[in-house]
């Protein structure tokens, strides 16, 4: 079944290649357990970036080496994304699945598209 | 293969206390979000609680707060659900949760005088 999911049209990652963005679903109904998704899209080619489940109430459950953290405030997720540099550049969707309990939904959104811009070196100084 | 076994259910008296413990097995015990679930007689399954992979994270269903408490042992594979001040409306099957994946086969909670 699926679900409407909203996000922002742009970010600009910082200058320590950090990234930060709303991933807010429409619940069709009360969801104990979440599956959060993000994926990049960049030159028609479309990447996992990372995935995260968690309970509602609960941190995200991202893998330890993941390059995304997260929390969770009712029907949105607050996700960040680390690391980033200029070859990054792209967009990032979030694909959102209600898992449990029935009926699963699934909703994606249009995408975020991220900007990041590697800081230009510290000139030498004698 | 992946187990989930659950232990330390049986007939309690109302006011009572009990101790889950669920053993894990067959996966990466660290990387899951765990939770309980209970299913009592003719009701749909619901969450009871759940805790972050470190153990930092809880939460509870509103029947539970302030009277179960659950815990992990990461070290030891193990999910626990303290049980106190156990009510009639308690009495169910509880299952353990590795979320979203994995279900135990659940252990029978009685309350009752």
């Known amino acids: 079944k699926a679900m409407h999911v909203a996000q922002p049209a742009v970010v600009l990652a910082n200058s320590r290649g950090t990234a930060s963005f709303v991933c807010e679903y429409a619940s069709p109904g009360k969801a104990t357990e979440v599956r959060v998704t993000v994926l990049r899209q960049a030159d028609s080619q479309v990447t996992e970036v990372c995935a995260a489940t968690y309970m509602m109430g609960n941190e995200l459950t991202f893998l330890d080496d993941s390059i995304c953290t997260g929390t969770s405030s009712g029907n949105q997720v607050n996700l960040t994304i680390q690391g980033l540099r200029a070859m990054d550049t792209g967009l990032y969707i979030c694909k959102v699945e209600l898992m449990y309990p029935p009926p699963y939904y699934m909703g994606i959104g249009n995408g975020t598209q991220i900007y990041v811009i590697d800081p230009e070196p510290c000139p030498d100084s004698d | 293969e992946v187990q989930l076994l659950e232990s330390g259910g049986g007939l309690v008296q109302p006011g009572g206390s009990l101790r889950l413990s669920c053993a894990a097995s067959?996966?990466?015990?660290?990387?899951?979000?765990m939770a309980w679930y209970r299913q009592a007689p003719g009701k749909e399954r619901e969450v009871v609680a759940g805790?972050?992979?470190?153990?930092?994270?809880?939460n509870y269903g509103d029947s539970v707060k302030g009277r179960f408490t659950i815990s992990r042992d990461n070290s030891k594979n193990t999910l626990y659900l303290q049980m106190n001040s156990l009510r009639a409306e308690d009495t169910a099957v509880y299952y353990c949760?590795?979320?979203?994946?994995?279900w135990g086969q659940g252990t029978l909670v009685t309350v009752s005088s």
């Open positions: 067959g996966f990466t015990f660290s990387s899951y979000t």
């Open positions: 949760r590795a979320v979203s994946d994995y």
């Open positions: 805790i972050s992979r470190s153990g930092g994270t809880t």
